[in-house]
Protein backbone atom coordinates (compact mmCIF):
# COMPACT_ATOMS: atom_id res chain seq x y z
CA UNK A 1 0.00 0.00 0.00
CA UNK A 2 1.50 3.52 -0.23
CA UNK A 3 0.33 6.98 0.87
CA UNK A 4 -2.11 9.26 -1.01
CA UNK A 5 0.05 11.68 -3.57
CA UNK A 6 2.43 8.88 -4.32
CA UNK A 7 1.27 6.03 -7.53
CA UNK A 8 -2.50 5.36 -7.05
CA UNK A 9 -3.48 1.86 -5.74
CA UNK A 10 -3.63 -1.72 -7.69
CA UNK A 11 -6.27 -2.65 -10.14
CA UNK A 12 -9.07 -3.31 -8.29
CA UNK A 13 -8.54 -1.20 -5.10
CA UNK A 14 -9.23 1.88 -4.15
CA UNK A 15 -7.53 4.00 -1.48
CA UNK A 16 -9.14 4.62 2.33
CA UNK A 17 -7.93 8.12 3.66
CA UNK A 18 -10.24 6.24 7.47
CA UNK A 19 -7.90 3.71 7.13
CA UNK A 20 -4.77 4.56 5.37
CA UNK A 21 -3.89 1.74 3.15
CA UNK A 22 -5.76 0.91 -0.38
CA UNK A 23 -8.76 -1.52 -0.19
CA UNK A 24 -10.31 -4.06 -1.74
CA UNK A 25 -13.55 -2.62 -4.11
CA UNK A 26 -14.37 -6.45 -4.04
CA UNK A 27 -15.65 -5.98 -0.38
CA UNK A 28 -17.95 -2.81 -1.34
CA UNK A 29 -20.28 -5.32 -2.09
CA UNK A 30 -20.61 -6.54 1.93
CA UNK A 31 -19.41 -2.63 2.79
CA UNK A 32 -20.95 -0.71 -0.11
CA UNK A 33 -21.08 2.79 2.48
CA UNK A 34 -17.41 2.61 2.82
CA UNK A 35 -15.94 5.97 1.97
CA UNK A 36 -13.32 3.95 -0.34
CA UNK A 37 -15.89 2.63 -2.38
CA UNK A 38 -16.52 6.22 -4.10
CA UNK A 39 -12.98 5.35 -6.17
CA UNK A 40 -14.04 1.89 -7.54
CA UNK A 41 -15.06 1.87 -10.79
CA UNK A 42 -16.34 -1.27 -10.25
CA UNK A 43 -20.43 -1.76 -11.80
CA UNK A 44 -23.17 -0.78 -8.73
CA UNK A 45 -22.48 -3.87 -5.90
CA UNK A 46 -24.64 -6.90 -5.93
CA UNK A 47 -27.19 -7.39 -3.28
CA UNK A 48 -24.72 -8.68 0.06
CA UNK A 49 -25.72 -11.57 1.78
CA UNK A 50 -27.80 -10.47 4.72
CA UNK B 1 2.81 -4.68 13.66
CA UNK B 2 -0.48 -6.64 13.81
CA UNK B 3 -1.50 -8.59 16.20
CA UNK B 4 -4.23 -10.53 17.79
CA UNK B 5 -3.29 -12.04 21.68
CA UNK B 6 -5.64 -14.61 22.69
CA UNK B 7 -6.42 -15.65 26.47
CA UNK B 8 -9.32 -18.09 27.59
CA UNK B 9 -9.42 -21.60 26.43
CA UNK B 10 -8.52 -25.05 28.44
CA UNK B 11 -11.13 -28.12 29.75
CA UNK B 12 -14.39 -27.80 30.77
CA UNK B 13 -17.19 -30.14 31.82
CA UNK B 14 -19.83 -31.25 29.26
CA UNK B 15 -22.56 -28.04 29.53
CA UNK B 16 -20.26 -25.94 31.47
CA UNK B 17 -18.99 -22.17 29.88
CA UNK B 18 -16.04 -20.73 28.65
CA UNK B 19 -14.95 -17.23 27.81
CA UNK B 20 -12.43 -16.17 24.87
CA UNK B 21 -10.81 -13.12 24.71
CA UNK B 22 -9.50 -11.39 21.73
CA UNK B 23 -6.82 -7.99 22.37
CA UNK B 24 -6.04 -6.45 18.82
CA UNK B 25 -3.19 -4.27 18.05
CA UNK B 26 -1.51 -2.69 14.25
CA UNK B 27 -4.94 -1.49 12.92
CA UNK B 28 -7.95 0.09 13.04
CA UNK B 29 -9.64 -2.16 14.98
CA UNK B 30 -12.96 -0.36 15.29
CA UNK B 31 -13.32 -0.84 11.20
CA UNK B 32 -13.21 -4.25 11.06
CA UNK B 33 -16.03 -7.21 11.32
CA UNK B 34 -14.23 -9.84 13.95
CA UNK B 35 -14.82 -13.04 14.03
CA UNK B 36 -14.19 -16.49 15.47
CA UNK B 37 -13.15 -19.70 13.54
CA UNK B 38 -12.45 -23.22 15.61
CA UNK B 39 -10.61 -25.92 13.56
CA UNK B 40 -10.88 -29.96 14.59
CA UNK B 41 -9.97 -33.16 13.11
CA UNK B 42 -13.34 -34.03 12.67
CA UNK B 43 -14.77 -31.14 11.12
CA UNK B 44 -11.27 -29.00 9.69
CA UNK B 45 -11.75 -25.37 9.77
CA UNK B 46 -15.25 -24.01 10.88
CA UNK B 47 -16.53 -20.35 11.21
CA UNK B 48 -18.15 -19.64 14.43
CA UNK B 49 -19.64 -16.35 14.87
CA UNK B 50 -18.76 -12.21 13.15
CA UNK B 51 -19.73 -9.23 14.89
CA UNK B 52 -19.60 -6.40 12.54
CA UNK B 53 -18.25 -2.48 13.11
CA UNK B 54 -20.46 0.12 14.88
CA UNK B 55 -21.31 1.25 10.94
CA UNK B 56 -22.75 -2.04 10.57
CA UNK B 57 -25.07 -1.35 14.12
CA UNK B 58 -22.71 -4.29 15.61
CA UNK B 59 -24.88 -6.90 13.79
CA UNK B 60 -24.08 -10.67 14.94
CA UNK B 61 -23.92 -13.68 13.15
CA UNK B 62 -24.18 -17.12 14.02
CA UNK B 63 -23.19 -20.47 12.81
CA UNK B 64 -26.42 -22.52 13.09
CA UNK B 65 -24.34 -25.23 14.89
CA UNK B 66 -23.41 -22.50 18.00
CA UNK B 67 -26.73 -20.63 17.70
CA UNK B 68 -28.26 -19.70 21.19
CA UNK B 69 -25.04 -21.32 23.24
CA UNK B 70 -22.49 -19.21 22.16
CA UNK B 71 -22.33 -15.20 22.30
CA UNK B 72 -20.28 -12.80 20.56
CA UNK B 73 -19.12 -9.04 21.85
CA UNK B 74 -16.65 -6.72 21.24
CA UNK B 75 -15.29 -3.33 23.18
CA UNK B 76 -13.23 -1.05 20.64
CA UNK B 77 -12.44 1.35 23.17
CA UNK B 78 -9.97 -1.08 24.45
CA UNK B 79 -9.91 -3.27 20.68
CA UNK B 80 -11.12 -6.28 22.48
CA UNK B 81 -13.45 -8.95 21.45
CA UNK B 82 -14.74 -11.89 23.18
CA UNK B 83 -16.67 -14.93 22.63
CA UNK B 84 -19.12 -16.75 25.42
CA UNK B 85 -20.03 -20.21 25.30
CA UNK B 86 -22.62 -21.70 27.23
CA UNK B 87 -24.25 -25.47 27.61
CA UNK B 88 -20.55 -26.63 26.16
CA UNK B 89 -20.77 -30.19 24.38
CA UNK B 90 -17.76 -32.68 23.23
CA UNK B 91 -18.59 -31.61 19.28
CA UNK B 92 -17.30 -28.31 20.54
CA UNK B 93 -13.85 -29.71 21.46
CA UNK B 94 -11.02 -27.50 19.01
CA UNK B 95 -8.92 -24.97 18.41
CA UNK B 96 -10.09 -21.46 18.52
CA UNK B 97 -9.22 -18.82 16.45
CA UNK B 98 -10.44 -14.75 16.09
CA UNK B 99 -9.67 -13.31 13.22
CA UNK B 100 -9.87 -9.85 11.62
CA UNK B 101 -12.08 -9.06 8.35
CA UNK B 102 -12.64 -5.83 6.43
CA UNK B 103 -15.43 -8.07 4.67
CA UNK B 104 -14.69 -11.22 3.11
CA UNK B 105 -11.17 -13.19 3.74
CA UNK B 106 -9.70 -14.07 7.34
CA UNK B 107 -6.65 -11.13 7.05
CA UNK B 108 -5.17 -11.32 11.07
CA UNK B 109 -5.59 -14.35 13.24
CA UNK B 110 -4.72 -14.84 16.46
CA UNK B 111 -2.23 -17.33 17.94
CA UNK B 112 -5.24 -20.14 18.62
CA UNK B 113 -6.49 -21.69 21.71
CA UNK B 114 -7.51 -25.29 22.78
CA UNK B 115 -10.87 -25.82 24.12
CA UNK B 116 -11.26 -29.10 25.42
CA UNK B 117 -14.73 -30.19 26.62
CA UNK B 118 -14.74 -33.53 28.36
CA UNK B 119 -15.94 -35.33 31.70
CA UNK C 1 -24.82 -23.39 3.04
CA UNK C 2 -22.33 -23.79 0.31
CA UNK C 3 -20.21 -26.82 0.46
CA UNK C 4 -16.75 -26.30 -0.55
CA UNK C 5 -15.09 -29.65 -2.17
CA UNK C 6 -11.36 -29.86 -2.05
CA UNK C 7 -9.30 -31.69 -4.22
CA UNK C 8 -6.73 -34.10 -3.55
CA UNK C 9 -6.58 -35.03 -0.03
CA UNK C 10 -3.64 -35.11 0.09
CA UNK C 11 -0.70 -33.97 -2.86
CA UNK C 12 3.24 -34.85 -3.22
CA UNK C 13 5.17 -33.20 -5.48
CA UNK C 14 8.56 -32.95 -6.80
CA UNK C 15 10.48 -29.76 -5.39
CA UNK C 16 10.86 -27.37 -8.32
CA UNK C 17 7.61 -28.74 -9.89
CA UNK C 18 4.17 -27.99 -9.97
CA UNK C 19 1.12 -28.45 -7.14
CA UNK C 20 -2.18 -27.67 -8.46
CA UNK C 21 -5.08 -27.47 -6.15
CA UNK C 22 -8.87 -27.81 -6.75
CA UNK C 23 -11.82 -25.94 -5.22
CA UNK C 24 -15.22 -26.56 -5.96
CA UNK C 25 -17.99 -24.35 -4.54
CA UNK C 26 -22.07 -26.14 -4.56
CA UNK C 27 -23.05 -22.86 -5.75
CA UNK C 28 -21.19 -20.03 -7.89
CA UNK C 29 -19.38 -17.68 -5.80
CA UNK C 30 -19.11 -15.31 -8.44
CA UNK C 31 -20.65 -11.71 -9.64
CA UNK C 32 -19.45 -10.71 -13.45
CA UNK C 33 -16.91 -8.54 -11.29
CA UNK C 34 -15.27 -11.02 -8.38
CA UNK C 35 -15.00 -14.35 -7.09
CA UNK C 36 -15.50 -14.28 -3.53
CA UNK C 37 -13.18 -17.47 -3.15
CA UNK C 38 -10.06 -17.33 -0.69
CA UNK C 39 -6.68 -19.44 -0.52
CA UNK C 40 -5.12 -20.08 2.97
CA UNK C 41 -1.54 -21.71 3.93
CA UNK C 42 -1.62 -23.57 7.37
CA UNK C 43 1.67 -25.11 8.65
CA UNK C 44 1.28 -27.07 12.03
CA UNK C 45 0.69 -25.30 15.13
CA UNK C 46 0.03 -22.14 13.49
CA UNK C 47 -3.18 -20.65 12.31
CA UNK C 48 -4.16 -20.03 8.48
CA UNK C 49 -2.36 -17.38 6.59
CA UNK C 50 -4.01 -15.80 3.48
CA UNK C 51 -2.10 -15.81 0.36
CA UNK C 52 -4.81 -15.51 -2.49
CA UNK C 53 -8.46 -13.53 -2.27
CA UNK C 54 -10.85 -12.97 -4.76
CA UNK C 55 -9.93 -15.77 -6.55
CA UNK C 56 -6.64 -14.11 -8.13
CA UNK C 57 -5.82 -11.52 -6.02
CA UNK C 58 -1.81 -12.48 -4.10
CA UNK C 59 -1.76 -11.14 -0.83
CA UNK C 60 0.78 -8.97 -0.27
CA UNK C 61 3.97 -10.35 0.98
CA UNK C 62 3.39 -13.56 -0.73
CA UNK C 63 5.51 -15.25 -3.42
CA UNK C 64 4.90 -14.93 -6.81
CA UNK C 65 5.40 -18.77 -7.03
CA UNK C 66 1.48 -18.96 -6.15
CA UNK C 67 -1.42 -18.07 -8.08
CA UNK C 68 -4.86 -18.57 -8.23
CA UNK C 69 -7.78 -18.69 -10.24
CA UNK C 70 -11.18 -19.62 -11.47
CA UNK C 71 -14.78 -18.40 -11.51
CA UNK C 72 -17.98 -19.73 -10.65
CA UNK C 73 -18.05 -22.72 -8.89
CA UNK C 74 -14.59 -23.88 -9.89
CA UNK C 75 -11.51 -22.44 -8.49
CA UNK C 76 -7.54 -23.43 -8.45
CA UNK C 77 -4.20 -22.65 -6.47
CA UNK C 78 -1.24 -23.25 -8.16
CA UNK C 79 2.22 -23.12 -6.63
CA UNK C 80 5.38 -23.20 -9.02
CA UNK C 81 7.82 -23.94 -8.38
CA UNK C 82 7.23 -25.36 -5.34
CA UNK C 83 9.58 -25.31 -2.37
CA UNK C 84 10.92 -27.05 0.83
CA UNK C 85 8.95 -24.77 2.83
CA UNK C 86 5.41 -25.21 1.03
CA UNK C 87 4.65 -28.11 2.88
CA UNK C 88 1.66 -27.36 4.82
CA UNK C 89 -2.26 -28.24 4.18
CA UNK C 90 -3.90 -25.55 1.79
CA UNK C 91 -7.53 -24.41 2.44
CA UNK C 92 -10.38 -22.62 0.37
CA UNK C 93 -12.95 -20.61 1.27
CA UNK C 94 -16.02 -18.58 0.32
CA UNK C 95 -17.51 -15.15 1.37
CA UNK C 96 -20.54 -14.96 -0.57
CA UNK C 97 -22.90 -15.58 1.98
CA UNK C 98 -23.72 -16.51 5.55
CA UNK C 99 -22.37 -18.86 6.67
CA UNK C 100 -18.68 -18.61 5.77
CA UNK C 101 -17.45 -22.30 5.13
CA UNK C 102 -13.88 -23.89 4.27
CA UNK C 103 -12.64 -26.75 2.10
CA UNK C 104 -11.55 -29.63 3.71
CA UNK C 105 -8.17 -29.16 3.11
CA UNK C 106 -5.29 -30.49 0.98
CA UNK C 107 -2.14 -31.68 2.67
CA UNK C 108 1.16 -30.94 0.35
CA UNK C 109 4.41 -33.26 0.64
CA UNK C 110 7.59 -31.91 -1.08
CA UNK C 111 9.50 -35.02 -2.37
Known amino acids: EQAPGTAPCSRGSSWSADLDKCMDCASCRARPHSEFCLGCAAAPPAPFRL | QVQLQQSGGGLVQPGGSMKLSCIAS????????MSWVRQSPEKGLEWVAE??????????HYAESVKGKFTISRDDSKSRFFLQMNNLRAEDTGIYYC??????????WGQGTDLTVSS | DIVMTQTPASLAVSLGQRATISCRAS??????????MHWYQQKPGQPPKLLIK???SLESGVPARFSGSGSGTDFTLNIHPVEEDDTATYYC?????????FGGGTKLEIK
Open chain 2, 99 to 108: SSTYADYFHY
Open chain 3, 93 to 101: QHSWEIPYT
Open chain 2, 51 to 60: IRSKSDNYAT
Open chain 2, 26 to 33: GFTFSSYW
Open chain 3, 27 to 36: QSVSTSTYSY
Open chain 3, 54 to 56: YAS
